[in-house]
Interface confidence: medium
């Protein structure tokens, strides 16, 4: 707690400017009006305040807004955001995507901090769902964001938002997460033609059921082995040799290299040897 002291004569700050870097922390507390600070927050980032001075500025804002900062202040926090605790952030009501972007920019290049996680949580809850623009923004800053959500949280993602998802955003998703996302992707891309549909749905196929894989096998999609290896084992097992051959197209030869790995290993064991022999790959059931 900074001790309350009178502002020295002639030091009352008429605006937030460079001269304040020469103020001791008790002078900042005594001579800077909190309401002035709130209206000129955008200037703070241009001034080389020490971390100690930023503590004082934060303290002033906390006193002015004990129930939480208004969005007009939050949007211009800049690197003062790094001083906020998750408890501070839980008091905020952030509705503007521009505000979210401005604060994520401050933390750019770093791992997601507890502050950022809290901010995102508050923002998404405030919006009621993870809409496309929000998802676009979050995955741009944190490619692994989507896969950090629980299946329950993912269930609030509307199909329209799936258009914002890039293949790399799903790299760390587990099967339970893909189980939730796949039906949404299927719905989102349903009006696309065969080859375009496959390009879009490919990275979500780890959540696809057998019947959808059977349908894809009829469309000359030429699925690569990397995608095939990420499919659910229980979805692959019922596929016939002919269906897998059609599904993989020219990539079917890659099965040999993967014959000891799931789901290929389990699938091979389920097939008749005569059927496997038709592939000419020397696969042994």
């Amino acid at each position: 707690e900074v001790e309350k002291t009178a502002c020295p004569s002639g030091k009352k700050a008429p605006e937030i400017d460079e001269s304040l870097i020469f103020y001791k922390k008790w002078e900042l507390e005594a001579c800077v009006d909190a309401a002035l600070l709130a209206t000129q927050m955008d200037r703070v980032n241009a001034i080389p305040f020490t971390y100690e001075q930023l503590d004082v500025l934060k303290h002033k804002l906390d006193e002015l807004y004990p129930q939480g900062y208004p969005e007009s202040v939050i949007q211009h926090l800049g690197y003062l955001f790094l001083k906020m605790s998750p408890e501070d952030i839980r008091k905020w009501n952030v509705t503007s995507l521009e505000t979210l972007k401005a604060l994520l920019e401050v933390n750019k290049g770093h791992e997601m901090s507890p502050q950022v996680a809290t901010l995102i949580d508050r923002f998404v809850k405030g919006r009621g769902q993870l809409d496309k623009d929000t998802l676009d923004t979050l995955t741009a800053f944190y490619p692994g964001y989507l896969c950090s959500l629980s299946p329950e949280e993912l269930s609030s993602v509307p199909p329209s938002s799936i258009w914002a998802v890039r293949p790399q955003d799903l790299d760390t998703c587990d099967p339970r997460q893909l189980d939730v996302l796949y039906p949404k992707a299927r719905l989102a891309f349903q009006n696309m033609n065969g080859s375009e549909y496959f390009v879009k749905i490919q990275s979500f196929l780890g959540g696809a059921p057998t019947e959808d894989l059977k349908a894809l096998s009829q469309q000359n999609v030429s699925m690569d082995l990397a995608t095939f290896m990420k499919l659910r084992t229980d979805a692959v097992l019922p596929l016939t040799v002919a269906e897998v051959q059609k599904l993989l197209g020219p990539h079917v030869e890659g099965l040999k290299a993967e014959e000891r790995h799931r789901p290929v290993r389990d699938w091979i064991l389920r097939q008749r040897q005569d059927d496997l022999d038709t592939l000419g790959l020397g696969l042994q059931g």
Epitope: I21, K25, A46, I47, T50, Y51, E52, D55, Y79, K108
Partner: antibody, heavy 118, light 107 residues
């Protein structure tokens, strides 16, 4: 990647001045602070001051006020430190460092040796 | 000014050891402590800031801890390339001040 390239070694006379430069590359120069640090032979590190290249705002260690002047040229992404009225006590290696991404002293220049000798 | 004291100027260690370097501030610095590594002929390198946050690219065998006035840098599994001089620094209030340094040497 972030790099800070400092000017070469200087041999200067007592009572004169010297200007050390620190050219930044690999990031937006005006976004982050540049710190200056002194190290005398066999001694520890001493903070001289900091400049915000975007605004020109500075803050000095009281000990170096009147001795060091920090400036920055946005057009060339270069920070400067001028040392005046040099004495043998000013013979040292001077480092610039960038508070890149708000990590304190995140990246350092290679250092500039200043030798004050008659 | 805040004084940062590294009580050990030298520490003997072996490859594979767990090493802890300590630093004491003359007043509470609210976890605003950084650690730097310096090898002969090189500039200091930032390892840790805000007492425990690892800087980009720093191996996870380096960890920082502490609060108030007492701070520690720990190397969980000493490697030959970690032989260097280590400085603590407070980045809480100006003038920012550094500890005198702790040099790690091979036993």
């Amino acid at each position: 990647q972030v790099q800070l390239q400092q000017s070469g070694a200087e041999l200067v006379r007592p009572g004169t001045s010297v200007k050390v430069s620190c050219k930044a590359s690999g990031y937006a120069f005006t976004n982050y602070l540049i710190e200056w640090v002194k190290q005398r032979p066999g001694q520890g590190l001493e903070w001289i001051g900091v400049i915000n290249p975007g605004s020109g705002g500075t803050k000095y260690n009281e000990k170096f006020k009147g001795k060091a002047t920090l400036t920055a040229d946005k057009s060339s992404s270069t920070a400067y430190m001028q040392l005046s009225s040099l004495t043998s006590e000013d013979s040292a290696v001077y480092f610039c460092a960038s508070d890149y991404d708000y990590d304190p002293f995140a990246y350092w220049g290679q250092g500039t040796l200043v030798t004050v000798s008659a | 000014d805040i004084v940062m004291t590294q009580s050990h100027k030298f520490m003997s260690t072996s490859v594979g050891d767990r090493v802890s370097i300590t630093c004491k501030a003359s007043q509470d610095v609210s976890t605003a402590v950084a650690w730097y590594q310096r090898k002969p002929g090189q500039s200091p390198k930032l390892l840790i800031y805000w007492a425990s946050t690892r800087h980009t690219g720093v191996p996870d065998r380096f960890t920082g801890s502490g609060s108030g006035t007492d701070y520690t840098l720990t190397i969980s599994y000493m490697q030959a390339e970690d032989l260097a001089l280590y400085y603590c620094q407070q980045h809480y209030s100006t003038p920012y001040t550094f500890g005198g340094g702790t040099k790690l040497e091979i036993k």
